[in-house]
């Protein structure tokens, strides 16, 4: 059975979400990748995507979202800068492989943004800066208007797990017929 997991990130307004989506297989390196939000009862909505083919170490910016695909590490780095409370929600990375359905990469990200800026940075100097420097050369990419009824899922329960522990993985049950290619935690 498919096991769907999510990881919770709790940040303050103005901070930066900086996450990585791990794609296992080298064959996905050049595939176009996208960052999506999943709202209850709705189909995933694509917020930003890499170019097609996806270029190595080449930032793509859409509004406050920056995507960088690092082929050498098998990772898509996603940054959402200057977070707002309204950004709270469930997000996922997917790999576009037309005409096939998109491949979903886990973990899904449960983002919780709260009001008020914390003056004490997190465990890393890059993680919670209020002022974020956008990379000097960024590209906007056109995302496919790809939707599939098979990618609609029931919104998983909200996470109550502790943050930043190995146990902040939540196993979601009753998720059927989700897209079929993963990647590492």
């Amino acid at each position: 059975a498919t096991k769907l997991t999510e990881e919770k990130y709790e940040l303050k307004e103005g901070q930066t979400l900086d996450v990585k989506c791990d794609y296992t297989l080298e064959k996905f390196a050049s595939s176009q990748k996208a960052w999506q939000i999943i709202r209850d009862g709705e189909m995933p909505k694509t917020l930003a995507c890499t170019e097609r083919p996806s270029k190595n170490s080449h930032p793509v910016q859409v509004g406050r979202i920056i995507l960088e695909d690092y082929h050498d590490h098998g990772l898509l780095r996603v940054r959402m800068v200057n977070l707002q409370v309204e950004d709270s929600g469930l997000y996922q990375c997917v790999i576009y492989q037309p005409p096939k359905e998109p491949h979903m990469l886990f973990d899904r990200i449960r983002l919780v943004v709260t009001k008020g800026f914390s003056g004490t940075p997190g465990s890393n100097e890059n993680s919670t800066q209020n002022v974020y420097k956008i990379p000097p050369t960024t590209t906007k990419a056109l995302c496919p208007l790809y939707t599939s009824p098979r990618t609609v899922t029931q919104a998983p329960p909200k996470s109550t797990a502790d943050v930043s522990t190995p146990d902040s993985e939540i196993n979601l049950t009753n998720v059927t017929d989700i897209i079929r290619v993963p990647v590492f935690n």
Epitope: E169, P182, F184
Partner: antibody
Amino acid sequence: EVQLVESGGALVKPGGSLRLSCAASGFNIGNTYIHWVRQAPGKGLEWIGRIDPAGGRTKYSPKVQGRFTISAPTSKNTAYLQMNSLKTEDTAVYYCTGHRGGTMDYWGQGTLVTVSS
Amino acid sequence: EIVLTQSPATLSLSPGERATLSCRASQSVSNYGISFLNWYQQKPGQAPRLLIYAASYQKRGIPARFSGSGSGTDFTLTISSLEPEDFAVYYCQQSSNFPWTFGQGTKVEIK
């Protein structure tokens, strides 16, 4: 060329502390994950934990959780393993490793930590 | 945590022979059609080297005589014809769940 170089291994008494360093070159650690793995003399490999240097998020093996702390300031392009309350069973060669698609693809040469009175 | 059990502990073979190494997981390490199971080779005094990832995908630059197979809980590393430099210890490792874990290793020694 991608390279990881560990340092800081030493002889330390039980209950003591030690900080290992892992200097990366040829890539930016903020764009990947860094793992620590150890190997006791004549024994197998044991995964200690992982950090996402960009976000500072860590994962640990339950065996070392609470005693060991991984950090990785991206400005220094170096990862650290802070080891506290060391026990004789922590004696091992400690490796830092770079991540590629759910694997530990490139490894440092290792640094030996000996915990003994 | 997921426990990986490798067998045999030691495999005594001659150069040119076929080596078959087994790795069994205490629970499935496969998801979305991919198995999060990797194989590493380690020679004395050296760091481990990645050979096979996602159960059956050969890392670039690894000789074709190394192959991996399996899914779910049972995995195999095969060395089709042993070369002198292949005598080493082999570890399987899972990346399906935290903590990541290794098998205890299989030593392939010269008969």
